[in-house]
């Protein structure tokens, strides 16, 4: 009868190299009595006997992996135990060898000139594949701008137009070579103006051609702006050749203007824009054409807010460095003066002053202030504020300064246009229209009969405006 014998592994496990989808076998020869139980582990995890990916034969001494996968890499151990002495173990590694495989191939890229481009090329393989790149038909050479990263991706700093082309990556190890598909790198270039339009000084009624040339990728579009708005007249001719667009704007000149050429192209969701401007001036302007002294805009001050028509345009006088602030300061000072006048006079005077300092404005090539109608000015002077006006006019020859209206920037009524001559040439005061029904009930406020009737006209719906462009007493 045989004597019991503890297990001894007579052929220790060795490192096994295997290709993916091939068979790999570990041999664990054991001598012992009685016959041992042999178990197998991979990375310390027990391999189950019924796992169909493995075949365990020869009483457990032979482990076969039927179709190797890259995830089978690891340390395999066999353990033999027959109850006599201790269990014994031997371990060996499985190294899965793999031909190169490109797991994340490059894709087509559009990139803006000057940016950084990265073309991916992630690979698998054992031994680890080396990655190189081909541009067109030639191997790509690395330089200070172009580098193949550890990951295999191609990085191009400060992309230039000449970097555009077809690229593919090549993964290579001792078992083989893999090639990616060809991909396209397109380099987009911001719109840039090559030739700006030139300024012209011409006579009235001349024809002028402004020329603007731009380059970019994609080819830019060119638009023209006249004094901040889209060009309303004139003909435009365009010619495109080799990424360059040439635009010519022909104009019939009846007024001076600032003409801007805007070149735009699109990069994905973003746009790039380049601009160049030229002035067209008219050699002989008449004096009257030069006389616009301001601009039209919304009144956004406080003092006249309740007096001026909502949302109306008023005239700002550019003889002041900051017209809006200067005129507001004037009215603010005037308003304080009005605290001293009678309740009859005050609202009428407020309406007069606000509509005189902030006159209704007609926008256009030459913004024009619309003065108060003479009749309304006289109504304030001779009816609503007769006492105050007399005091104010008398101050100069009496040498007296008394509270009332003597500091106020009031208009000289006689110099204002009459609404009977042209109702559209002057501004009405709605406050007075509203009050005219009650004028007969007002106490007598002057010794002589007033020289003016409150005008019997519908209240104006026009807006009131801003500009001390008229003489003030």
């Amino acid at each position: 009868e045989k004597l019991p014998k503890a297990p001894v592994i007579t052929t220790p496990l060795e490192t096994v190299d295997a290709l993916v989808e091939e068979v790999a076998t570990f041999m664990c020869a054991v001598e012992s009595y009685p016959q041992p139980e042999i178990s197998w582990t991979r990375n310390k995890i027990l391999i189950k006997l019924f796992d169909t990916r493995y075949s365990i034969r020869e009483n457990g001494q032979l482990l076969t992996i039927l179709s190797v996968e890259d995830s089978d890499d690891g340390i395999y151990c066999c353990t033999a135990n027959n109850g006599v002495g201790g269990a014994v173990e031997s371990c060996g590694a499985l190294q899965v060898k793999m031909k190169p495989k490109i797991t994340r191939p490059p894709i087509n890229v559009k990139i803006i000139e000057g940016l950084k481009a990265v073309l991916p090329c992630t690979t698998m393989g054992n031994p680890k594949p080396s990655v190189s790149w081909i541009k067109g038909d030639s191997a790509l050479r690395e330089n200070s701008r172009i580098a193949v990263l550890e990951s295999g991706s191609l990085r191009i700093h400060n992309v230039q137009k000449e970097d555009a082309g077809q690229y593919r990556c090549v993964a290579k190890n001792s078992l083989g070579t893999a090639y990616s598909k060809l991909v396209k790198l397109e380099v987009e270039v911001f719109a840039r103006i090559l030739r700006a339009p030139e300024s012209h000084n011409v006579t009235f009624g001349s024809f002028v051609t402004l020329r603007c040339t731009a380059i970019g990728m994609p080819v830019p579009t060119i638009s023209w702006i006249e004094n901040g708005n889209a060009v309303s007249s004139g003909s435009i001719q365009e010619n495109v050749k080799d990424r360059v667009i040439d635009s010519r704007l022909q104009l019939f000149i009846t007024k001076p203007g600032l003409y801007t050429c805007i070149a735009t192209n699109k990069h994905g969701e973003k746009f790039s824009t380049a601009k160049a401007a030229a002035t067209v001036s008219i050699a002989e302007w008449s004096k009257s054409q030069k006389e616009s002294k301001g601009y039209c805009a919304q009144y956004r001050g406080e003092v006249c807010d309740a007096v001026l028509v909502k949302d109306s345009l008023v005239f700002f006088n550019t003889s002041y460095p900051d017209p809006e602030e200067a005129q507001e300061l004037l009215i603010h000072t005037a308003w304080n003066e009005l605290k001293a006048v009678s309740p009859l006079c005050r609202p009428a005077a407020e309406a007069l002053l606000c509509n005189h300092l902030f006159q209704e404005c007609s926008p256009g090539v030459l913004p024009t202030p619309m003065p108060i109608c003479r009749e309304y000015c006289l109504a304030v002077k001779e009816l609503f504020c007769a006492k105050e006006w007399l005091a104010m006019e008398g101050k100069t020859h009496r040498g007296l300064y008394r509270s009332g209206m003597h500091f106020l920037p009031v208009p000289e009524c006689s110099k204002l246009p009459s609404m009977h001559q042209d109702p559209t040439a002057c501004t009405r005061l709605p406050y007075l229209d509203y009050k005219k029904e009650n004028i007969t009930t007002f106490p007598s406020i002057t010794s002589s009969k007033p020289s003016v009737d409150i005008p019997n006209l519908p209240a104006s719906t026009s807006s009131f405006a801003v500009s001390p462009a008229y003489s003030m007493t």
Epitope: A297, R300, E325, E328
Partner: antibody, heavy 121, light 112 residues
Framework: EVQLLESGGGLVQPGGSLRLSCAAS????????MSWVRQAPGKGLEWVSA????????YYKESVKGRFTISRDNSKNTLYLQMNSLRAEDTAVYYC??????????????WGQGTLVTVSS | QTVVTQEPSFSVSPGGTVTLTCGLS?????????PDWYQQTPGQAPRTLIY???SRHSGVPDRFSGSILGNKAALTITGAQADDESDYYC????????????FGGGTKLTVL
């Protein structure tokens, strides 16, 4: 040199109140309109309220009307924003800003560094 | 309710020119909206660049200019520099019903 220094921010529960102050120096305070502008974390600027140099009118963003009150003390060169019934969406950095002139709606030409208001339970 | 629209982002090359715009969801921007432009870098208070359409704030380089282009307000930066990379906000005076001041959502400008 124009200087605007906000204070009074902090953590407050929804429904609570805070009063922000803005101490101004380096200019004639009463000659300029003032505003409060806020900026929620990671968001853009949002105008909240304005007041002219005289303090005679006040203007508010619709969502804060009835809850916020802007005021100024020209003798103390100080702008205030009283915030009541605070909501989580009022959480922001609140900037005090000087207008370019006496009116309430001139350009904002000088800004404080801001004070953080957090409304959270 | 007045909604002011700006491009969310824009990029420009150093030395290049870029025009940022500011529009109204309903209607055109005019000089009566007194468009103002502000620059803000992360963690800083805003800085005024342009006020009332085209007036440059003191100390602002003349590379920055404002205008009305068509139905929008525009801020043009010529000869862009790396430190122009910021958020840009426009502010408009609005007078629909009651006086208001409304900021656009801002444009993130990247100088590449």
């Amino acid at each position: 040199e124009v200087q605007l220094l906000e204070s009074g921010g902090g953590l407050v529960q929804p429904g609570g109140s805070l009063r922000l102050s803005c101490a101004a120096s380096g200019f004639t305070f009463s000659d300029y309109g003032m505003s409060w502008v806020r900026q929620a974390p990671g968001k853009g600027l949002e105008w909240v309220s304005a007041i002219p140099g005289s303090g005679g009118s006040t203007y508010y963003k619709e969502s804060v009307k009835g809850r916020f009150t802007i005021s100024r003390d020209n003798s103390k060169n100080t702008l205030y924003l009283q915030m009541n019934s605070l909501r989580a969406e009022d959480t922001a950095v609140y900037y005090c800003a000087k207008r370019s002139g006496r009116i309430a709606f001139g350009a904002l030409d000088a800004w404080g560094q801001g004070t953080l208001v957090t409304v959270s339970s | 309710q007045t909604v002011v629209t700006q491009e969310p982002s824009f990029s420009v090359s150093p030395g290049g020119t870029v025009t940022l715009t500011c529009g109204l969801s309903s209607g055109s921007v005019t000089s009566s909206n007194y468009p103002d432009w502000y620059q803000q870098t992360p963690g800083q208070a805003p800085r005024t660049l342009i006020y009332s359409t085209d007036s440059r704030h003191s100390g602002v380089p003349d590379r920055f200019s404002g205008s009305i282009l068509g139905n929008k307000a525009a801020l043009t930066i010529t000869g862009a520099q790396a430190d122009d990379e910021s958020d840009y906000y426009c502010g408009l005076y609005s007078y629909s019903g009651s006086k208001n001041y409304v900021f656009g959502g801002g444009t993130k400008l990247t100088v590449l």
